[in-house]
């Protein structure tokens, strides 16, 4: 399997429509929770919480702040900790608790604490209860958590150092911890939990489980560094501890090693990231996305590996176990545990099987079973992917956070369909197409490129969006920016299976938002842009400009997949001789006009699509050069009417008898590039055209034309 | 002056492995796709594959791009060539060539010789 | 893939005169009015050398005897008049489809 290639098209920040929140002196906006039903987006950050429109995030709803008193700062700072930094209250847990309340914890100037937040009043009730286990200490440190049925599961540290990690169950009637051992959690990195409910036609009467991600030290290779390892476990939701042994403990605490590599290079990712688990109506069971990067990543390498769920089940259930053994001289500590196993299964939920044998709870597990899952808690089988390999593997690039979305195209296929945010504050839309990968677009989230830290994905039909949390705000994005594909063949070669090109409004539309039946759209998910109606109109841009000076013809191809060249009459230009040159790859750069070079230009790209290259015109030009005759008069500028009710500009600018000729604007470089020289700031008010005077008077006037295209295939 | 320069070719073993490079100078190149070309002796030329500006979009030559990368190193002017599990039909003259679009080479290099026999 | 078919295999024409070269693809290679097809001369011991490009265009440095026209499936290549120096293969190529392909190549030989 191939790097995945480089996104589509780039969209910057400026671009495309993108809502923002945040809010002055408010940082670390690391916790999102949306509730669809009321269309609001919770948010927890540095010492505050918000609730924004989910539709419109810039629109603030309600705020309370829970801030870290002087004194707690003091006492922090006296630990060696930063109090600007460190010694301040970081939102780590925002979870539903009820219809009107959120379970809210912070880390609280290392001092966590968790409290009850009343969303009619948008006050927290001041429970102040203890944090610890529920929440880090240090604000640097990995945390996890997910909220089943009013009781709270997390994964993170127990003390101050952070050196005690913790799965824990914080309940009034069953509070639930992991052990303190190293065969648990040996320095774990928490990544994600999440609860997985049993089918309701299960015949078997099993128990719900709840799933915790993360990334540890191995111990079943000890070499010369740290091997890192990533983990999925499971525990079950009716666990409540065993009697004697494993008093208050999970019983039913296993983990496996998550696969994810490139067999055929010997790529390793085993940094895990995140993760995302995929819900659909189509899914019998769900399927789990896991972002990786590799423990030695110097190159920037990223990959998403997909599972069943029911693989990783099976694992848990059928898997043979590991045990710790004391070889002399052996990078393996331990090995597959061959021996007898106890019964009822170790580590099993108690299911209607249990039940008949007279084991109602876990409470009533025999010690043997008790005693074999604490000794045992690794499983020796580990989870494979779908497909046994990456969906994608990228090279360049550091992703951070994932969500995928599973859409149906036009043709019934279905897509699923992954965005994943990067270190340097940018979002990636990718789809598997024939076993490749297709990264339709980047979309510049933040200006000023620092890491996504959170994402999150609304599910609700119609109103669509992804929502990114970083160090200084949130982010909204549409799902798409099918509109930003201004023709047929954009929209085609977009691949992106949210846009179709609709022939009667000659736009691009999204899918999801069309209410109309979607005969006569466009759709071609192979990227076959012949399936578009031919144009029957090409519509050039008419320039003027001035003999000896520079043109700049642009031609506006956003794809990065695409390459152009130019056509000046019916021959192909080779844009780098001393008359012609190209300026980011694009646009042509006439030199020293003359006569000579009027006529029309043509900007053509050309794109491969699997094995068929897609050529399209992207840009017309009318250039007409004329000799100016000096004006003796002083500059003028006239604004005068073209066609199509644009206005364009006449700029005359008048030169010195006797002076030297005017400089070019433009000067070529022997290695062939081209250096511009800075652009004079423009000139005028709001309500005039801004004119911009280059040393050579270039501009004279342009227009837009209609004329009847012969040359469409 | 544009120059491109193949190194890397030789004598080896059917199964084995070789590193083609091509030293570009003279242009930027960062600023161009570049492409290998093959020719078997006294034989006709085939396209073996090519690579967009900043080495993220390779194609290839679908009989071939199972054993074959192309890639490149900008801060070096390199292109290169990696492949594996030689045949004895890949025995041929490896050109390095620059890729104008649309889709013509201006510029070859000398070619490196590579012969794939036991 | 798009077969290039060159004929003649080779020639002898006489210094002076006009040598023609035709190539024939099994599909078209034209697309809004751009013409993929391009020649290339090569020598013994050289690489290809690019002598057109899109059909018709004359690469810089390439003396104007060398002429090339064509479109859709057809196209030839002229040199007019031939010199000395003008023996060599010629190749024909299309970059309209994936792969690339070339011709079989013509021989020229000078009288």
């Known amino acids: 399997m191939a790097f995945a290639p480089i996104p589509r098209i780039t969209w910057e920040h400026r671009e495309v429509h993108l809502v923002q929140f945040h809010e002055p002196d408010i940082y670390n906006y690391s916790a999102l929770l949306l509730s669809e039903d009321k269309d609001t987006l919770y948010i927890g950050a540095r010492e505050a919480v918000f609730a924004v429109n989910a539709l419109n995030i810039s629109e603030k709803q309600h705020e309370v702040y829970w801030k870290v008193s002087e004194d707690k700062k003091a006492k922090c700072a006296e630990k060696g900790k930063s109090k600007q930094t460190e010694c301040l209250n970081y939102i780590r847990v925002l979870q539903p608790l009820s219809a009107t309340s959120l379970y809210v914890c912070g880390t609280n100037a290392f001092q966590p604490a968790c409290d009850h937040l009343n969303l009619t009043s948008f006050k927290f009730l001041g429970k102040n209860e203890d944090g610890k286990g529920r929440c880090p200490f240090d604000p640097a440190h990995s945390y996890t958590s997910v909220m089943v049925d009013g009781e709270l599961y997390s994964g993170t540290s127990y003390n101050f150092l952070g050196s005690e990690p913790i799965i824990s169950r914080n309940s009034s009637h069953s509070p639930l911890r992991t052990e303190y051992a190293i065969p648990w959690l040996n320095e774990p990195s928490f990544v994600f939990a999440d609860v997985i409910r049993k089918s309701p036609d299960s015949p078997d009467g099993e128990d719900d489980r709840v799933y915790f991600f993360f990334t540890e030290v191995s111990v079943e290779y000890e070499f010369v560094f740290r091997v890192l390892i990533p983990r999925i476990a499971r525990v079950c939701k009716g666990d409540q501890g065993g009697l004697r042994t494993l008093q208050k403990k999970w019983t039913s605490f296993l983990k496996a090693r998550l696969i994810c590599s490139r067999p055929d290079s010997g790529l390793v990712f085993n940094v895990l990231r995140d993760v995302f688990v995929l819900r659909s109506p189509g899914l019998k069971v769900p399927v789990f996305y896991a972002l990786f990067t590799p423990q030695l990543n110097n190159v920037g390498l990223s990959a998403v590996c997909a599972y069943n769920l029911s693989t990783a089940e099976e694992v848990f259930s059928h898997g043979k176990y590991m045990q710790s053994t004391t070889v002399e001289q052996s990078h393996t500590k331990w090995v597959r545990y061959n021996g007898p196993v106890p019964k009822p299964r170790p580590g099993a939920c108690i299911d209607s099987e249990a039940r008949a044998a007279n084991y109602t709870s876990s409470l009533n597990l025999p010690d043997k079973t008790l005693q074999f899952v604490k000794d045992h808690p690794l499983m020796d089988d580990s989870v494979t992917p779908i497909d046994n390999r990456p969906r994608l593997i990228k090279k360049d690039v550091n992703y951070t956070q994932i969500v995928v979305d599973r859409t149906q195209a036009l043709d019934g296929t279905v897509y699923d369909v992954m965005f994943v945010s990067t270190d340097r504050g940018a979002l990636h839309k990718a789809i598997s197409l024939e076993h490749a990968v297709h990264i339709i677009e980047e979309t510049q989230l933040f200006q000023d490129f620092e890491p996504v830290q959170t994402l999150l994905l609304s599910s609700k039909k119609g109103n669509r969006f992804v929502y990114a949390g970083s160090n200084s705000g949130v982010v909204q994005a549409p799902l798409a920016f099918c509109g930003k594909h201004g023709t047929c063949e954009d929209c085609v070669l977009a691949r992106d299976p949210y846009c179709a090109w609709s022939p009667p409004t000659a736009t691009c539309v999204a899918l999801h938002q069309t209410e109309s039946p979607s005969r006569g759209l466009i759709q071609e998910m192979s990227g076959d842009a012949s399936v578009c109606p031919d144009k029957s109109k090409g519509s050039y841009r008419q320039h003027f400009f001035k003999h000896g000076g520079t043109a700049e013809l642009k031609c506006s191809q956003k794809s990065n997949l695409a390459r152009v060249f130019w056509k000046f009459q019916n021959g192909v230009l080779k844009a780098e001789s001393p008359k012609y040159g190209l300026m980011g790859r694009k646009n042509l750069l006439i030199f020293n006009l003359s006569e000579g070079d009027s006529g029309v230009y043509q900007c053509l790209s050309e794109e491969r699509v699997k094995n068929k290259t897609v050529f399209q015109v992207v840009a017309k030009h009318v250039l007409e050069v004329k000799v100016v005759p000096k004006p003796v008069v002083a500059p003028t500028l006239s604004v005068v009417q073209t066609e199509g009710s644009r206005i364009a500009t006449k700029v005359l600018v008048a030169s010195t008898q006797g002076s030297s000729p005017p400089t070019p604007a433009v000067q070529a470089t022997s290695s062939g590039a081209i250096t511009l020289p800075p652009k004079p700031a423009p000139t005028g008010t709001s309500c005039e055209p801004k004119i911009v005077i280059n040393t050579v008077p270039q501009l004279h006037s342009e227009k837009t034309m209609y004329l009847k295209s012969s040359d469409n295939r | 002056e544009v120059k491109l320069v193949e190194s890397g070719g030789g004598l080896v073993q059917p199964g084995s492995s070789m590193k083609l490079s091509c030293t570009a100078s003279?242009?930027?190149?960062?600023?161009?796709?570049m492409a290998w070309v093959r020719q078997v002796p006294d034989k006709g030329l085939e396209w073996v594959a090519n690579i967009n500006y900043d080495g993220n979009n390779p194609y290839y030559v679908d009989s071939l791009k199972t054993r074959f990368i192309i890639s490149r190193d900008n801060a070096k002017n390199i292109l290169y060539l990696q492949m594996s599990s030689l045949k004895s039909e890949d025995t041929a003259t490896y050109y390095c060539?620059?890729?104008?679009?649309?889709?013509?080479?201006?510029?070859w290099g000398q070619g490196t010789t590579l012969t794939v026999s036991s | 893939d798009i077969v290039l078919t060159q004929s003649p295999a080779s020639l002898a024409v006489s210094l002076g005169q006009r040598a023609t070269i035709s190539c024939r693809a099994s599909?078209?290679?034209?697309?809004?009015?751009?013409?993929?097809m391009h020649w290339y001369q090569q020598k013994p011991g050289q690489p290809p050398k690019l002598l057109i490009y899109?059909?018709?265009n004359l690469e810089s440095g390439v003396p104007a005897r060398f002429s090339g026209s064509g479109s859709e499936t057809d196209f030839t290549l002229n040199i007019h008049p031939v010199e000395e120096e003008d023996a060599a293969i010629y190749f024909c190529q299309q970059s309209i489809e994936d792969p690339h392909t070339f011709g079989g190549g013509t021989k020229l030989e000078i009288k």
């Open positions: 060539a620059r890729d104008i679009s649309p889709g013509y080479f201006d510029h």
């Open positions: 003279g242009f930027t190149f960062s600023d161009y796709y």
């Open positions: 599909e078209s290679v034209s697309i809004h009015g751009t013409h993929l």
């Open positions: 899109a059909a018709s």
